[in-house]
Interface confidence: medium
């Protein structure tokens, strides 16, 4: 998109991580069909892509989960596209909702996220979660990632 | 994106198309209002989205579909994003899940994949899902595309 | 994503506003965090986004509603991108649909639309739904934009 | 609607501490951040500390920073400021402010505010 | 740390009056500017957000403008129930910093 050294192309896209933690945040690695194009973008503590330019940039995300009604609380799951921005408190730039299904043992669901946003040179993006513990990690279904305009 | 005889732009959007086959790979079409930039990328068999260019590339798919629990197999009904790549095995690169709906005869859901992936020359894009037969092809509902970086 | 003077970046992402208006187009406002790389794109009369240049564009829209079965019409919430260029008559580009939850008093569901287009000078481009007053609001949920590769 | 009761403000003497609660009430306690801001006896505001909705992030001022420590329990729906090392010019009255839902770094509901003075 | 600083500290006017408050910031902050009334023994209340945005339930009466580092809060026609202390707020960089306040009293 960028193209010759002055503006080299900026886009990762990376991998859920199943995670023991506790955190709302989700955990992503660089494996499998992974994308990293250069050291402009990287994966920072497996939990956030952080960038090194200013600029606009198309970020994405996407989560399936695997809920059931009776055994989740009735808040639906929310999944968050988060910002955090050198000297400015965290923001939600994206959320989506989906109500837990009634099927049992749980009714996977599938959330995307996308949109443009201005990003300071050391931004960071990150996804929150209302339940980790419901994300499905099989090949494919949850990812995380950006582009550079 | 790409400007100048060196870097054209290089995208596709293409309108799902009812099939007979019994296949799960779904089928395209460029009809209505569709995109092909050029013959830098290419619809082959009504199936794939091929490109001559290696790079990265976003490449996205909507599936809108119309199930019924009770009718329906217990499994979810799930899209996937696949790419082959010439002497390479296929891979799946993104994959959503929803489950069938209560509703009847049939409730409706929509799966939006997306994301930003390496391909190599001659490398083909295809869309996957669990039933074809539940597709919705009304205008608009399902769709697949890419566009270069 | 275009350098340079004859190739400035046009993006936009404009964040939705609850309106008292009865129409099914869908209003979004310049607030919170919100794009809009220069006059080449346009957020008018607060509904539809126009652009000034010739182009293909990824245009997307996300929108969060709440709804229940019981209390909605038997007919799914749809969502639909549709365009409105010079000369012509409005089209449907892109639609999703998904069936009513059965939570009470309401289950939230999102919808995520996007695709590449070619746009005219002067075109606009704006977000249907069955019932604007089942939309959510809340930071992040529902919003609109576009990039031109 | 929204509220929010501070708590747990008083005579304190130099070199004590003190915690501060806010009990929030009316919205969804765990989708927002938290502040605590300031205003000393005639003067003005002076922000003092935020959370993260999650409790995972959190700010200071340079003024109480390693000595004052924001928190919060969102399964009670309380914001607490545990004020250790105060001094004279920490005499103010703290009040709790939900960060607004387009920025979170604007305040769109306040409490009354406790007052905290340091005084020997 | 970004300063804000208003003007005037105090003035006085008149039910009626078309009232101004300036806010000058030490850098440009964009329009991530905040304005807020308190009236004595109270909390304060936000008026305006992002530089023009109205706060839900605020009369229209207040509007606010400017971008970068000067700012302006303007209430057309004073009404009884403006008499306050006013402050301008960033919120473009940590830590948030308030003016010193502007105090509009009863002539």
């Known amino acids: 998109m960028q193209k010759g050294d002055q503006n080299p192309q900026i886009a990762a896209h990376v991998i859920s991580e199943a995670s023991s933690k506790t955190t709302s945040v989700l955990q992503w690695a660089e494996k499998g069909y992974y994308t990293m194009s250069n050291n402009l973008v990287t994966l920072e503590n497996g939990k956030q892509l952080t960038v090194k330019r200013q600029g606009l940039y198309y970020i994405y995300a996407q989560v399936t989960f695997c809920s059931n009604r009776e055994a989740s609380s009735q808040a639906p799951f929310i999944a968050s596209l988060c910002l955090k921005s050198p000297g400015r408190f965290e923001r939600i730039l994206l959320r989506a909702a989906n109500t837990h299904s009634s099927a049992k043992p749980c009714g996977q669901q599938s959330i995307h996220l996308g949109g443009v946003f201005e990003l300071q040179p050391g931004a960071s993006v990150f996804v929150n979660v209302t339940d980790p513990s419901q994300v499905s990690h099989g090949t494919g279904f949850t990812s995380f990632g950006l582009l550079k305009l | 994106m790409q400007k100048g005889d060196q870097n054209p732009q290089i995208a596709a959007h293409v309108i799902s198309e009812a099939s007979s086959k019994t296949t799960s790979v779904l089928q395209w079409a460029e009809k209505g209002y569709y995109t092909m930039s050029n013959n830098l990328v290419t619809l082959e068999n009504g199936k794939q989205l091929t490109v001559k260019r290696q790079g990265l590339y976003y490449i996205y798919a909507q599936v809108t579909f119309c199930s019924n629990r009770e009718a329906s197999s217990q499994a979810p009904f799930i899209a996937s994003l696949c790419l082959k790549s010439p002497g390479r095995f296929e891979r799946i690169l993104l994959r959503a899940a929803n489950t069938h709906s209560s509703a009847k005869p049939c409730g409706q859901q929509s799966i939006h994949l997306g994301g930003v992936f390496e391909l190599q020359p001659g490398a083909s894009v295809f869309v996957n899902v669990t039933d074809p037969s539940q597709v919705s092809h009304g205008t608009g509902f399902t769709s697949f595309g890419l566009l270069k970086l | 994503m275009q350098k340079g003077d004859q190739n400035p970046q046009i993006a936009a992402h404009v964040i939705s506003e609850a309106s008292s208006k009865t129409t099914s187009v869908l209003q979004w406002a310049e607030k919170g965090y919100y794009t809009m790389s220069n006059n080449l794109v346009t957020l008018e009369n607060g509904k539809q986004l126009t652009v000034k240049r010739q182009g293909l564009y990824y245009i997307y829209a996300q929108v969060t509603f709440c709804s229940n079965r019981e209390a909605s019409s038997q007919a799914p919430f749809i969502a639909s991108l549709c365009l409105k260029s010079p000369g012509r008559f409005e089209r449907i580009l892109l639609r999703a649909a998904n069936t009513h939850s059965s939570a009470k008093p309401c289950g939230q569901q999102s919808i995520h639309l996007g695709g590449v287009f070619e746009l005219q000078p002067g075109a606009s481009v704006f977000v249907n739904v069955t019932d604007p007053s089942q939309v959510s609001h809340g930071t992040g949920f529902t919003s609109f934009g576009l990039l031109k590769l | 609607e929204v509220q929010l009761l501070e708590s747990g403000g008083g005579l304190v003497q130099p070199g004590g501490s003190l915690r501060l609660s806010c009990a929030a009430s009316?919205?969804?306690?765990?989708?927002?951040?938290m502040n605590w801001v300031r205003q000393a006896p005639g003067k003005g505001l002076e922000w003092v500390s935020a959370i993260s909705g999650s409790g995972e992030s959190t700010y200071y001022a340079d003024s109480v920073k390693g000595r004052f420590t924001i928190s919060r329990d969102n399964s009670k729906n309380t914001l607490y400021l545990q004020m250790n090392s105060l001094r004279a010019e920490d005499t103010a009255v703290y009040y709790c402010?939900?960060?607004?839902?387009?920025?979170?770094?604007?305040?769109?509901?306040w409490g009354q505010g406790t007052l905290v003075t340091v005084s020997s | 740390d970004i300063q804000m600083t208003q003007s005037p500290s105090s003035l006085s006017a008149s039910v009626g009056d078309r009232v101004t408050i300036t806010c000058r910031a030490s850098q440009s902050i964009s329009r991530y500017l905040n304005w807020y009334q308190q009236k004595p023994g109270k909390a304060p209340k936000l008026l305006i957000y992002a530089e023009s945005t109205l706060q839900s339930g605020v009369p229209s009466r207040f509007s606010g403008s400017g971008s970068g580092t000067d700012f302006t809060l303007t209430i057309s026609s004073l009404q009884p129930e403006d008499f306050a202390t006013y402050y301008c707020q960033q919120s473009y960089t940590i830590p948030l910093t308030f003016g010193q306040g502007t105090k509009v009293e009863i002539k």
């Open positions: 402010a939900r960060a607004h839902d387009y920025d979170s770094m604007l305040m769109d509901y």
């Open positions: 009316g919205f969804t306690f765990s989708k927002y951040a």
